[in-house]
Interface confidence: medium
């Protein structure tokens, strides 16, 4: 979690002198409670916006907006604390609006916005706006919270943001997986314009089961520049054991901008259709593992193999 470095955030508006300050998320009013405190924010809204940094990078940001209630407590409103909590890491970042003048009622409702919290793709956040000073220990809460889910890099607008592009969002491998026969699976995909290696993970499942009955990893060396954007194909030779028939192929690139953390793409091949009069299916789950020559699951023998070609 971080704040956008440009432009400087502004909270002042007509009729209000205000400045934005970094906050430790522990306002002084927690430690020294006040007798009179303002009411809670109203109509808190969080939206996905996009903003450029000073260097020209594009980032997703949380656009936070709320209004004040039309009661007399605005006379005691000294500012607001904005808190963003990333739910999967418990990381929290706060800023404080410090009012430098007293608020007065006027012809329109007071409205505040802040769009400087940079958020990450495919993450969920809890956004809280606390009016300051915070309430006394047993006082009514004067904050409002909302959860905010940031779309992943598949989202059209997200795809062109710097974090998504860094993780390889512009690469579309257009994977096709084809069962050649009972023992061969062919994987085709488009290479990206970078001399980096790829990894193919084949995970196989029995029909209608979600526990994998086999995993196999295959390494594809870095293509040469003349192979960039070309189709590459890999043929995996499998052990043919009944039941382990649904195959998920996942391709992981290792681009320089994201290394081990690049976006992965996958495709699935379903089990073949059952005949009208199916053979009885055994009540066990077959488990198998091919022996591979060039793959990473390498044994002393060479019963199974994987080989790949690049098409120009």
């Amino acid at each position: 979690l971080r704040l956008l470095d440009f432009p400087a955030p502004v909270c002042a508006q007509e009729g209000l002198s205000c400045r934005v300050k970094n906050s430790t998320c522990l306002d002084d009013s927690w430690i020294h409670p006040r007798n009179l405190t303002p009411s809670s924010p109203k109509d808190l809204q969080i939206q996905l916006h996009f903003a450029h940094t000073q260097q020209g990078d594009l980032f997703p940001v949380a656009h936070i907006e709320w209004t004040l209630q039309t009661d007399a407590s605005i006379l005691y409103l000294e500012g607001a604390e904005l808190s963003v909590l990333q739910l999967n890491t418990n990381e929290r970042l706060c800023v404080r609006f410090e009012f430098l003048s007293k608020l007065r009622h006027h012809h329109r409702r007071w409205r505040f916005t802040f769009s400087h919290f940079v958020v990450d793709p495919d993450q969920e956040y809890e956004v809280t706006v606390h009016h300051l000073p915070k309430p006394i220990p047993d006082g009514d809460p004067n904050h409002q919270s909302k959860n905010f889910l940031v779309p992943d890099c598949e989202h059209a607008r997200m795809k062109v943001t710097t974090p998504c592009m860094s993780s390889g969002s512009l690469w579309d491998p257009n994977i096709t997986v084809e069962t050649l026969d009972t023992q061969h699976l062919r994987v085709d995909f488009t290479l990206w314009n970078e001399s980096t290696h790829y990894q193919i993970l084949l995970t196989s499942f029995p029909h209608m089961e979600n526990h994998s009955c086999f995993e196999h990893m295959h390494h594809i060396p870095a293509p040469r520049p003349e192979e960039f954007h070309q189709r590459s194909n890999v043929t995996l030779t499998l052990r043919n054991l009944k039941g382990c028939c649904r195959h998920q192929v996942q391709i992981q690139p290792f681009f320089s901008s994201c290394l081990n953390d690049c976006l992965r793409h996958s495709a699935t091949v379903s089990c073949p259709e059952m005949p009208d009069t199916p053979e009885p299916i055994p009540d066990y789950m077959p488990l198998w593992e091919p022996r591979s020559g060039s793959s990473d699951y390498k044994d002393d023998d060479d019963k199974g193999s994987s080989h790949h070609h690049h098409h120009h």
Epitope: S212, M217, P286, L287, W288, E289, Y297
Partner: antibody, heavy 116, light 107 residues
Framework: QVQLVQSGAEVKKPGASVKVSCKAS????????ISWVRQAPGQGLEWMGW????????NYAQKLQGRVTMTTDTSTSTAYMELRSLRSDDTAVYYC?????????WGQGTLVTVSS | EIVMTQSPATLSVSPGERATLSCRAS??????LAWFQQKPGQAPRPLIY???TRATGVPARFSGSGSGTDFTLTISSLQSEDFAVYYC?????????FGGGTKVEIK
């Protein structure tokens, strides 16, 4: 050379939990799954389950389902096996082994004693 | 689950003699069978996989054969270090299962 080094012996009370670690070295950790096998005193070998070090996929023995959890930490090339609600018949040497099916390298074993 | 039955439970053999250990599966496991050797206080050591392929570093006196339901581990000329317990294991189906073991002891 490939090595799997397990954590030390444990003595636990019935109902408690135990977490055994298995640190791998000498190969790329995420290229091979880790299986767990146990052996009660004077008894044969019993397969407990397997975890993919790459995807985190797991398969557990039916009789241990709900009591066992296998995890990995790829940053330290370490696999973990946690067994909960321990009973006296869980007293055994617990082994980690490399690969999903045929186990080509084994840890030295961790003796877990369950006794009140 | 597939039940693996080993016989005999104990085999008494003199050094230099041939030892033949048997392993039977309750249903076909194709060639998806491994053999392990275990000495007291030690972890099992892989000997054979895919029914007949020797693991790395295993001496040629150990050989495996069979497919389907009946498998054999043969030690052509027993050395003193071969006295141990031997287990077979199938990896054709979940759950993976081991035989009860055959103890090879000095006659």
């Amino acid at each position: 050379q490939v090595q799997l080094v397990q954590s030390g012996a444990e003595v636990k009370k019935p109902g408690a939990s135990v977490k055994v670690s298995c640190k791998a070295s000498g190969y790329t950790f995420t290229r091979y799954g880790i299986s767990w096998v146990r052996q009660a005193p004077g008894q044969g070998l019993e397969w407990m389950g397997w975890i993919s070090t790459y995807s985190g996929n797991t398969n557990y023995a039916q009789k241990l389902q709900g009591r066992v959890t296998m995890t990995t930490d790829t940053s330290t090339s370490t696999a973990y096996m946690e067994l909960r609600s321990l009973r006296s018949d869980d007293t055994a040497v617990y082994y980690c082994a490399r690969r999903q099916l045929y186990f080509d390298y084994w840890g030295q074993g961790t003796l877990v004693t369950v006794s009140s | 689950e597939i039940v693996m039955t080993q016989s005999p439970a104990t085999l008494s053999v003199s050094p230099g003699e041939r030892a033949t250990l048997s392993c039977r599966a309750s249903q076909s496991v194709s060639s998806n069978l491994a053999w392990f050797q275990q000495k007291p206080g030690q972890a099992p050591r892989p000997l054979i996989y895919d029914a007949s392929t020797r693991a790395t570093g295993v001496p040629a006196r150990f050989s495996g054969s069979g497919s389907g339901t009946d498998f054999t581990l043969t030690i052509s000329s027993l050395q003193s270090e071969d006295f141990a317990v031997y287990y077979c294991q199938q990896y054709d189906n979940w759950p993976l299962t081991f035989g009860g073991g055959t103890k090879v002891e000095i006659k």
